[in-house]
């Protein structure tokens, strides 16, 4: 079977353009090295948002310029995406790969629809 990956169906970004969700996977084995990738699907186009490889029990490390941060706990990854704007609304898909030890496993979640609403500009005060 494909490795099952679960994530919430819908998340609303906060007023600062930050959205968080949990990506949970059912590990068929005892993985020590895991890679998590967040993909955005919109109009059948798929782009990579961010990715991190981590050792079980350690922190996720994203690239310095990544808009993502995250923590792991067992088979759960808590992901946060920052700097989102209304145009970034879309389906954010969690892809999990068990890199080591063999055999390799991979699973893809059904996606979290993230809605982003740009805040209204503050009216000028006299």
């Amino acid at each position: 079977k494909a490795m099952h990956v679960a994530q919430p169906a819908v998340v609303l970004a906060n007023s600062r353009g930050t959205a968080s969700f949990v990506c949970e996977y059912a590990s068929p084995g005892k993985a020590t090295e895991v890679r998590v990738t967040v993909l955005r699907q919109a109009d059948s186009q798929v782009t990579e948002v961010c990715a991190a490889t981590y050792m079980m029990g350690n922190e996720l490390t994203f690239l310095d310029d990544s808009i993502c941060t995250g923590t792991s706990s067992g088979n759960q990854v808590n992901l946060t995406i920052q700097g989102l704007r209304a145009m970034d609304t879309g389906l954010y898909i969690c892809k999990v790969e068990l890199m080591y030890p063999p055999p390799y496993y991979m699973g893809i979640g059904n996606g979290t629809q993230i809605y982003v609403i740009d805040p209204e500009p503050c009216p000028d005060s006299d």
Partner: nanobody, 126 residues
Framework: EVQLVESGGGLVQPGGSLRLSCAAS????????IGWFRQAPGKEREMVSC????????KYADSVKGRFTISRDNSKNTVYLQMNSLRAEDTAVYYC???????????????????WGQGTRVTVSS
Amino acid sequence: EVQLVESGGGLVQPGGSLRLSCAASGFSSDYYDIGWFRQAPGKEREMVSCIRSSGGSTKYADSVKGRFTISRDNSKNTVYLQMNSLRAEDTAVYYCGLAPISPVHAVCNQHYFGYWGQGTRVTVSS
């Protein structure tokens, strides 16, 4: 453990034909994308053609449209690539790939592939 075993590669003259086969095992889901990718020396791996297991949606690279045909035999868990009117630029190592997707995922998107065969070499030369 997912295994993809390719066969059918070889040396062929320009204008000739080859039929590649990919036998998949260790994957019991009835929903997935499976397809052919190729990598020429010094180049990135590119999708050649792909087919969805359920419904049979297909996708072809512009460079092979009208010359290559992908098909599948679900009873044998095998996918075929019939390659006609071969050209020198088709020379590459051809890989079979599998994406453990669901209906929400865009058809045959390279980001969703994670399982790969060892590859079979195709050489088009006179």
